[in-house]
């Protein structure tokens, strides 16, 4: 006579919210006679899931006909799965007892875990911009997934990054989980057009990972290089002062011309030229009439980029001795 075995073939069952879950249980022997009940959990606090005799279990149906005397299949189907249904389910054979039935043998259990997709990863950059050579942090967050196992990778322009730290919470059993990862990226001057990508792979995604991206343009500030040149004009005693502001990002730049310390013109960069790397160039010029100048003229160009401290570049226009007796005049 074969000894009764309770067979629960699946150790883990992944089910999405709203789906039905089939919990399989077969027995190897019809004997001894007695009912098979289903429980979630173990010990005195276990929850009765199905009992063919007692109780009302509207969401539970049996897979086979339990009224057939030769039935050896005690599998059940639970409909409309919710997160509250997660747990380990046991089919348990009882012998009739008085006043209570006596547990005879339990199956090994099937863990039902909620199969929930992770949310689309959201990548956020640093609160403030940083300049090239500095390191900035990007954070990737995704939540609501189950089971807990998940893979997260970082890429910069398609190249995998290695400097990142990832946490999945909570550490223990939960209905669903969240992931948070922080990657450290060293900025380069050409990173205006760069992109970081956070890629999340999970069993629910069938090999098609979710991605979230962030543009390094939101995190980088490339300070301008400044160059001042002067060119004498053929017509009369005029000098064209050209101020070139090169390779800066972002666009917001303000330029102020000062003549001997006095503001003579302020302008905001508007007609910019864009470089291949995404930085900008801008040229401003000032026409100075030197014929009427008595003293040397100190021309200062003050550049304020992206709210940073102003950078000054000065140029001295030397006036000839006989002109120093004349009154000065500048055309702007």
């Amino acid at each position: 006579e074969e000894e009764l075995q309770m067979i629960q073939p699946e150790k883990l069952l992944l089910v999405a919210v709203g789906e039905s879950a089939t919990l399989n249980c077969t027995v190897t022997s019809l004997l001894p006679v007695g009912p098979v009940l289903w429980f979630r959990g173990v010990g005195p606090g276990r929850e009765l899931i199905y009992n063919q005799k007692e109780g009302h279990f509207p969401r539970v149906t049996t897979v086979s006909d339990l009224t057939k005397r030769n039935n050896m299949d005690f599998s059940i189907r639970i409909s409309s799965i919710t997160p509250a249904d997660a747990g380990t389910y046991y089919c348990v054979k009882f012998r009739k007892g008085s006043p209570e039935n006596v547990e005879f043998k339990s199956g090994p259990g099937t863990e039902m875990a909620l199969r929930a997709k992770p949310s689309a990863p959201v990548v956020s950059g640093p609160a403030a911009r940083a300049t090239p050579e500095h390191t900035v942090s990007f954070t990737c967050k995704s939540h609501g997934f189950s089971p807990r196992d998940i893979t997260l990778k970082w890429f910069k322009n398609g190249n995998e990054l290695s400097d990142f730290q990832t946490n999945v919470d909570p550490a223990g059993q939960s209905v669903s989980y969240s992931i948070r990862s922080t990657a450290r990226v060293v900025l380069a001057p050409w990173d205006v057009r760069s992109q970081v990508t956070c890629e999340v792979a999970h069993v629910t995604l069938q090999g098609d990972p979710l991605r979230g991206t962030a543009n390094l343009s939101e995190a980088i500030r490339v300070p301008p290089t400044l160059e001042v040149t002067q060119q004498p004009m053929r017509a009369g005693n005029q000098v064209n002062i050209t101020y070139q502001v090169r390779n800066f990002y972002p666009q917001n730049l303000q330029l102020t011309w000062l003549e001997n310390g006095n503001v003579c013109r302020t302008e905001t960069a508007s007609t910019l030229t864009e470089n291949k790397d995404g930085t900008y160039n801008w040229t401003s010029w000032l026409l100075v009439n030197t014929s009427d100048q008595r003293d040397d003229v100190v021309l200062t160009c003050q550049v304020k980029h992206d709210g940073q401290l102003a950078v000054n570049k000065s140029l001295v226009l030397e006036v000839s001795a006989h002109q120093k007796d004349q009154s000065s005049d500048a055309t702007h």
């Epitope: 006579e1 001894p32 006679v33 007695g34 063919q52 005799k53 005397r69 008085s98």
Partner: antibody, heavy 119, light 107 residues
């Protein structure tokens, strides 16, 4: 094949005890429970009690409590029902019946033992 | 205790007739009901268990139906060997109880 063979008819005096045996063959006693049912002459069926084939656990009808005892001997595959303090109204045919499945129906019955209580 | 009320207590029918016997439980017993046939001087014989499951070897003219409190045993075409007394029994909870029986006699 499965059989339940009961002991023979008994005639007892009021106040005496009777012990009816039910020998099981063709199956393992441990695997099935037994119900005892009686039937007075010309009357219907009356459930007397139940004994577990697994551990000898019992449950008796309230009206027989204190007078009935059900036991089992797994070594001989025999179940016993003893009724004490017999009265004339205990005159009946006594049946042992096997509990056939978890639906707890009686799928096999003994041939019955007539117990007559008469002074 | 769960009371089982069987009706009718007796009926007369002819061979080939369709016979219906009812059994009512005093409270819900789901499908925990068995039907037995007993002939004079013999032990009862199981016909139906779990309200509607036909016991192995029992002719298919016997059928059971019902759930909760109301149950029916039907003999679709009465045969000569079917003249007997029929009992329902609730197997839901102790104390197990039988209906009073229905005697099916030849008309």
């Amino acid at each position: 094949q499965v059989q339940l063979v009961q002991s023979g008819a008994e005639v007892k005096k009021p106040g005496a005890s009777v012990k009816v045996s039910c020998k099981a063959s063709g199956y393992t006693l441990n695997n099935y429970d037994i119900n005892w049912v009686r039937q007075a002459p010309g009357q219907g069926l009356e459930w007397m009690g139940w004994i577990s084939g697994y551990n000898g656990n019992t449950n008796y009808a309230q009206k027989l409590q204190g007078r009935v005892t059900m036991t089992r001997d797994t070594s001989t595959s025999t179940v016993y029902m003893e009724l004490s303090s017999l009265r004339s109204e205990d005159t009946a045919v006594y049946y042992c019946a096997r509990v056939g499945s978890s639906w707890e129906e009686n799928d096999q019955w003994g041939q019955g033992t007539l117990v007559t209580v008469s002074s | 205790d769960i009371q089982m009320t069987q009706s009718p207590s007796s009926l007369s029918a002819s061979v080939g007739d369709r016979v219906t016997i009812t059994c009512r439980a005093s409270q819900s017993i789901s499908r925990w009901l068995a039907w037995y046939q007993q002939k004079p001087g013999k032990a009862p014989k199981l016909l139906i268990y779990a309200a509607s499951s036909l016991e192995s070897g029992v002719p298919s003219r016997f059928s059971g139906s019902g759930s909760g409190t109301d149950f029916t045993l039907t003999i679709s075409s009465l045969q000569p060997e079917d003249f007997a007394t029929y009992y329902c029994q609730q197997t839901h909870s102790f104390p197990l109880t039988f209906g009073g029986g229905t005697k099916v006699e030849i008309k």
